[in-house]
């Protein structure tokens, strides 16, 4: 889609956005009993030259950015990424109609970076 | 700069991509006395729905890519980001001239993912 | 060996687009991106954008966004640049150039001659 | 934006005398990704000189650059007839490329 951001430059740096997913929206409620949504939260944002601290970036990230200035038509920006992700236990009907809980690992974004 | 992909339907799916930086044309050829470079690669691509296999994505991805598929213009794609970095030795010159062999960690991509 | 090679010359009425292309031969189309420059008279050389014609990748000067679209076809292995509500200011000849990961422009179309009178 | 300045505007010499051409840069260019480019009338500019000092290919060793940071340098020893010509400078360490304004070296 053309839905990228067209100026980078006015884009905020790597960070963590809040979202609430509510199951319903993504058409699970018949199957998930509980909870009814949860904060999942997104990263976005620039992973500009210089990298801060903030930016919890890998050495690898460091070195692609620096590819990136002198090469930007054949090596991206490093992404904003999740760095720390929660899991999440959820009450749900299998496929035979039992209720099961389960943990479900990596659905929360806890903080991001540039990766 | 404007340099987001215009058409990412033309756009591969998220993946490695080779990629070789040699120290001097980072700059940093007077401090890094060996290797001369190495094999950084880099990760590139689309993370659209449906997410395969093969993006080894983690749960928030796949909730990220529906939540972005209803809703374009607030929530992005997950970003291509590696999955996999090892580490590489370098010998280089401390800031009082002694000779020193580090392992840096984080410095190649051997895998990427949808994040 | 290399060869990039321009359509001819325009003549356009202000206000009026153009759609310059360039037909790369003789090395892996998709590889390479490919620059578009151009000069006025009498101007210094001047960056208008480019494109990376493996992934449609694009990027352009501020000075051109909104009126510049860089694009590409890789069956004719050929590039476009088309610039659109032209003015007087942008008579000159607009080149297209490729450079290879870390270096310079290496080779160059031979120019297109872009007039804009009314 | 890195503005690069070239000096002198026009170099009237004889064939076989030698040319030193500047190109001064508003900010220090990194890893000496700098370049120098001759353009003939109604030509397109053929690359000479990348890294600031290494010639490209088939370009004759008559042609040196030299210079880091800011201050670069383009010296042609003997010139040939071939040689008169305008001579670009450029840095490409990233985006926006720039270009100096050329200086114009002709037959005095």
């Known amino acids: 889609s053309a839905s990228d951001y067209n100026s980078s430059e006015l884009k905020t740096a790597c960070r963590k956005h809040e979202l609430y997913v509510s199951f319903q929206d993504l058409g699970w409620q018949d199957w998930i009993i509980a909870p009814k949504g949860y904060a999942a939260n997104y990263c976005d944002g620039e992973c500009s030259f210089p990298l801060n601290a903030h930016m919890n970036a890998t050495n690898h990230a460091i070195v692609q950015t620096l590819v990136h200035l002198m090469n930007p038509e054949y090596v991206p920006k490093p992404c904003c990424a999740p760095t720390k992700l929660n899991a999440i236990s959820v009450l749900y009907f299998d496929d035979n109609s039992n209720v099961i809980l389960k943990k479900y690992r990596n659905m929360v974004v806890r903080a991001c970076g540039c990766h | 700069s404007a340099s987001d992909y215009n058409s990412s339907e033309l756009k591969t799916a998220c993946r490695k991509h080779e990629l070789y930086v040699s120290f001097q044309d980072l700059g940093w050829q007077d401090w890094i006395i060996a290797p001369k470079g190495y094999a950084a690669n880099y990760c590139d691509g689309e993370c659209s729905f449906p997410l395969n296999a093969h993006m080894n994505a983690t749960n928030h991805a796949i909730v990220q890519t529906l939540v972005h598929l209803m809703n374009p213009e607030y929530v992005p794609k997950p970003c291509c980001a590696p999955t996999k970095l090892n580490a590489i030795s370098v010998l280089y010159f401390d800031d009082n001239s002694n000779v020193i062999l580090k392992k840096y960690r984080n410095m190649v991509v051997r895998a990427c993912g949808c994040h | 060996q290399v060869h990039l090679v321009q359509s001819g010359a325009e003549v356009k009425n202000p206000g009026a687009s153009v759609k310059v292309s360039c037909k790369a031969s003789?090395?892996?189309?998709?590889?390479?991106?490919i620059h578009w420059l151009r000069q006025a008279p009498g101007q210094r050389l001047e960056w208008m954008g480019w494109?990376?014609?493996?992934?449609?990748?694009?990027d352009y000067s501020q000075k051109f966004q909104g009126r510049v679209t860089i694009s590409r076809d890789t069956s004719a292995t050929t590039a476009y640049m088309e610039l659109s509500s032209l003015r007087s200011e942008d008579t000159a000849v607009y080149y297209c150039?490729?450079?290879?990961?870390?270096?310079?422009?290496?080779?160059w179309g031979q120019g297109t001659l872009v007039t804009v009178s009314s | 934006e890195i503005v690069l300045t070239q000096s002198p505007g026009t170099l009237s010499l004889s064939p076989g005398e030698g040319a030193t051409l500047s190109c001064r840069a508003s900010?220090?260019?990194?890893?000496?990704?700098l370049a120098w480019y001759q353009q003939k009338p109604g030509q397109a500019p053929r690359l000479l000189i990348f890294?600031?000092?290494s010639r490209a290919t088939a370009i004759p060793d008559r042609f040196v650059g030299s210079g880091s940071g800011t201050d670069f340098t383009l010296t042609i020893t003997g010139l040939e007839p071939e040689d008169f010509a305008v001579y670009h400078c450029?840095?490409?360490?990233?985006?926006?490329?720039?270009f100096g304004q050329g200086t114009k070296v002709e037959i005095k």
């Open positions: 450029q840095h490409y360490g990233g985006s926006p490329w720039t």
């Open positions: 150039a490729r450079r290879q990961l870390w270096l310079p422009f290496d080779y």
């Open positions: 900010q220090s260019i990194s890893n000496n990704f």
């Open positions: 494109i990376n014609p493996g992934n449609v990748k694009t």
């Open positions: 890294g600031a000092s």
């Open positions: 003789g090395y892996t189309f998709t590889t390479f991106a």
